[in-house]
């Protein structure tokens, strides 16, 4: 009769984390008598995964009844697979011997690779706001995935970005991997409503990528433009001067009126008008009693926005 | 030697659509000589799935080498499973005979059930807007799932709804199923920012339910409240009357001022103030030259909102 062969039909098996892995093994003969064992790895440091006759292997079940007469199927199933279970598994036939059983023949091995999903990408932006035309950095991180192959893309409002750098760690073999990417985004005045998206594609996601987002509203400061104008008034002894504060973000704004350099009134903006692009407008007016002035008056609208240095605009009111 | 038995160790196997199904079968003896075949179903109408010796079965692979001497493992793997593959599969041993091989013994059968994910739920709302305190209906649909057991829940802003009716079709056995649910939602004035969510849980989703959403902003109309007031004016010959249009949604609004029933001015609201609840406010003012009037004037602020019938508020301006 032909000498026994140990057949491991699959060279490799890929399993999703949390699932069970079936490792198949068949013998071509019932002879010689002796137990079957499964190991991970080869050589002196190999790890025993299953011993047919003794030991405790709660995660392992046999696919068929090993003690059944004429059974030649020694396939096993390992439950609740994690990335740490990856490796090459060998089905090994032993021949009974004294004092110890003797290894008789090993299968060619089945490489178990574990597919583990990446964690939800976390996108974080800059610690301080920047103004339009400046560049800010966003980072995206995801962990715990396997295999190592992964694709990361950045988008701003659906448009793919190209200025980014991505690392997958560790560089060598590992049970699972992490990805870290930094994208550089140039801010524009219209970016209050903009979003950056980090999109991760991985074999475990079955074509349904994971996305992490960040709002540019957290990263941008749009400084206001000021315009001071005089409104027509039908009453002769009064002048109505308005300060139009336009297209600023975020909300926080304090306005001070000065008459010839002296503080006349200070206001904190509350009810703002929101523009379509997410910036705000606000208008303040000053009624000036022209009877109280002999000479021309310089009216100054001074605005402090989001804790930044104040900006101002002046208007010379002619007293005729 | 004992008479040959055909062992199908699994009574049932459940596989996700797109994956491969392994159907296990082992013989307890090499005798009698004859081929093995796999069928779906029993009786005269059974479907041949695999014939060891002849025919073309591109989706079927054998788990071990069937021609190997002493092989007793006749397990097969069927690739790219779809819901249409569900059924009971029998491993059948034939004995060589003349003119035809004769069925010798059948395994007990393995029921293959196919797990197919439901499609992303699509939520649709009413065709026309309704006002607060009225009830509107939302529908949610999802298709193509298997098995039939599925759970659908409705939420409004995270609060579970109870007034809904759900059907799963068809009622009898099918390769896949569809779900249709209609929820009745009572609108409130604060619902512009509200969302209804249809949440579907199914065994294939591994505890990560699918969600479909609809915004109540598409379904609601919040009619405005009007308030007409006179503002103090320092100029004696002028009166400033304002019409405060509050808490309306959606944006579309046209305002007409009438003086003693005659149209004075018509405006279309553009720059609106958005409230926290998503409704809008707008203010219009009318400067009235009191010198031009001898008698008291009735000023009417008339508002047409979102194509609905106009509402109005009047103010009697006393000419002293």
């Amino acid at each position: 009769e032909d000498e026994l062969q140990v057949i491991q039909p699959e060279k490799s098996v890929s399993v999703a984390a949390g699932e069970s892995a079936t490792l198949r093994c068949a013998m071509t003969s019932l002879i010689p008598v002796g137990p079957i064992m499964w190991f991970r790895g080869a050589g002196a440091g190999r790890e025993l995964i299953y011993n047919q006759k003794e030991g405790h292997f709660p995660r392992v079940t046999t696919v068929s009844e090993l003690t059944k007469r004429n059974n030649l199927d020694f396939s096993i199933s390992i439950s609740n697979i994690t990335p740490a279970d990856a490796g090459t598994y060998y089905c090994v036939k032993f021949r009974k011997g004294s004092p110890d059983d003797v290894e008789f023949k090993s299968g060619a091995g089945t490489e178990l690779s574990v597919r583990a999903k990446p964690s939800a990408p976390v996108v974080s932006g800059p610690a301080v706001r920047a103004t339009p035309e400046h560049t800010v950095s966003f980072t995206c991180e995801s962990h715990g995935f396997s295999p190592r192959d992964i694709t990361l893309k950045w988008f701003k409002n659906g448009n793919e970005l190209s200025d980014f750098q991505t690392n997958v760690d560790p560089a060598g073999d590992s049970v699972s991997y992490s990805i870290h990417s930094t994208a550089r985004v140039v801010l524009t005045r219209g970016d209050v409503h903009s979003q950056v998206i980090c999109e991760i594609a991985h074999i475990t996601l079955q074509g349904d990528p994971l996305r992490g987002t960040a709002n540019l509203s957290e990263a941008i400061r749009v400084p206001p433009t000021l315009e001071v104008t005089q409104q027509p008034m039908r009453a002769e002894n009064q002048a109505n001067v308005t300060c139009q504060v336009s297209n600023f973000y975020p909300r926080g704004l304090q306005l001070t009126w000065l008459e010839n350099g002296n503080v006349s009134r200070t206001e904190t903006a509350s009810t703002l008008i929101e523009n379509k692009d997410g910036t705000y407008n606000w208008m303040s007016w000053l009624l000036v009693n022209t009877c109280a002035h002999r000479d021309d008056v310089v009216l100054t609208c001074q605005v402090e926005h989001d804790g930044q240095q104040a900006v101002s605009k002046s208007y010379a009111l002619e007293i005729s | 030697e004992d008479e040959l038995q055909v062992i199908q160790p699994e009574k049932s196997v459940s596989v996700a659509a797109g994956e491969s199904a392994t159907l296990r079968c082992a013989m307890t003896s090499l005798i009698p000589v004859g081929p093995i075949m796999w069928f779906r179903g029993a009786g005269a109408g059974r479907e041949l799935i695999y014939n060891q010796k002849e025919g073309h079965f591109p989706r079927v692979t054998t788990v071990s080498e069937l021609t190997k001497r002493n092989n007793l493992d006749f397990s097969i793997s069927i690739s790219n499973i779809t819901p249409a593959d569900a059924g009971t599969y029998y491993c059948v041993k034939f004995r060589k005979g003349s003119p035809d091989d004769v069925e010798f013994k059948s395994g007990a059968g393995t029921e293959l059930s196919v797990r197919a994910k439901p499609s992303a739920p699509v939520v649709s709302g009413p065709a026309v807007r309704a006002t607060p305190e009225h009830t509107v209906s939302f529908t949610c649909e999802s298709h193509g799932f298997s098995p039939r057991d599925i759970t659908l829940k409705w939420f409004k802003n995270g609060n579970e709804l109870s007034d809904f009716q759900t059907n799963v079709d068809p009622a009898g056995d099918s390769v896949s199923y569809s779900i249709h649910s209609t929820a009745r939602v009572v609108l409130t004035r604060g619902d512009v920012h509200s969302q209804v969510i249809c949440e579907i849980a199914h065994i294939t989703l591994q505890g990560d339910p699918l969600r479909g959403t609809a915004n109540l902003s598409e379904a609601i109309r919040v009619p405005p409240t009007l308030e007409v007031t006179q503002q103090p004016m320092r100029a004696e010959n002028q009166a400033n009357v304002t019409c405060q249009v509050s808490n309306f949604y959606p944006r579309g609004l046209q305002l007409t001022w009438l003086e003693n029933g005659n149209v004075s001015r018509t405006e279309t609201a553009s720059t609106l103030i958005e409230n926290k609840d998503g409704t809008y406010n707008w203010m219009s003012w009318l400067l009235v030259n009191t010198c031009a009037h001898r008698d008291d004037v009735v000023l009417t602020c008339q508002v047409e909102h979102d194509g609905q019938q106009a509402v109005s508020k009047s103010y009697a301006l006393e000419i002293s």
């Epitope: 008598v33 137990p35 002196a44 440091g45 190999r46 790890e47 025993l48 995964i49 011993n51 006759k53 003794e54 030991g55 405790h56 090993l66 003690t67 009974k96 004092p99 110890d100 | -």
Partner: antibody, heavy 113, light 108 residues
Framework: EVQLVQSGAEVKKPGATVKISCKVS????????MHWVQQAPGKGLEWIGR????????KYAPKFQGRVTITADTSTNTAYMELSSLRSEDTAVYYC??????WGQGTLVTVSS | EIVLTQSPATLSLSPGERATLSCSAS???????LYWYQQKPGQAPKLWIY???NLASGIPARFSGSGSGTDYTLTISSLEPEDFAVYYC?????????FGQGTKLEIK
């Protein structure tokens, strides 16, 4: 449920032979090696030997070789351990165990003249 | 024959303290074949840790096992009253199988 039930306590004279049984339920004895372990009063555990009930193959510790015989009856799902030429230092609790994971309750053997 | 030597023979500690039990082998043992058992007076030993570091079913997470080659350790991070017992290490890497002499963990 896996259970290993051993026979009751024995008192023997020096030179005699004792045979302890271990009846198992919840599994087929042929599927696993059956081990026997000795524990003298106040002392540690000592491995005696094991049997493969499928083919009756045995392994023994050198200390017990020649005096111990382990057998199994697959029809009754029972393993046996026989120790001959008893001496006072054989006074101990004897345990059977299934594949190193599940243990019987122990059988006390007292050797005394 | 592989001789397993456990240290200390007796360990006196109070509940809440950390316990470290050692098991040293006279020649290398594959980590797959190193087991730990707990035994309380009048009871049969119970499998506690298998394959060096895996907790048997129902064993609390305060227990852990580690080691390789000739040196193995059982650690209890914070002792509970029910942990006081005798612990044995056991190798089944080669015949004859052997046990350590045991470490008695007693209440201080």
């Amino acid at each position: 449920e896996v259970q290993l039930v051993q026979s009751g306590a024995e008192v023997k004279k020096p030179g005699a032979t004792v045979k302890i049984s271990c009846k198992v339920s919840g599994f087929n004895i042929k599927d696993y090696y059956m081990h026997w372990v000795q524990q003298a009063p106040g002392k540690g555990l000592e491995w005696i030997g094991r049997i493969d009930p499928e083919d009756a193959e045995t392994k023994y510790a050198p200390k017990f070789q020649g005096r111990v015989t382990i057998t199994a009856d697959t029809s009754t799902n029972t393993a046996y351990m026989e120790l001959s030429s008893l001496r006072s230092e054989d006074t101990a609790v004897y345990y059977c165990d299934r594949g190193l994971a599940y243990w019987g309750q122990g059988t006390l053997v007292t050797v005394s003249s | 024959e592989i001789v397993l030597t456990q240290s200390p023979a007796t360990l006196s500690l109070s509940p809440g303290e950390r316990a470290t039990l050692s098991c040293s082998a006279s020649s290398s043992v594959s980590s797959s074949y190193l087991y730990w058992y707990q035994q309380k007076p009048g009871q049969a030993p119970k499998l506690w840790i298998y394959s060096t570091s895996n907790l048997a079913s129902g064993i609390p997470a305060r227990f852990s096992g580690s080691g390789s080659g000739t040196d193995y350790t059982l650690t209890i991070s914070s002792l509970e009253p029910e942990d006081f017992a005798v612990y044995y290490c056991h190798q089944w890497s080669s015949y004859p199988y052997t046990f350590g002499q045991g470490t008695k963990l007693e209440i201080k």
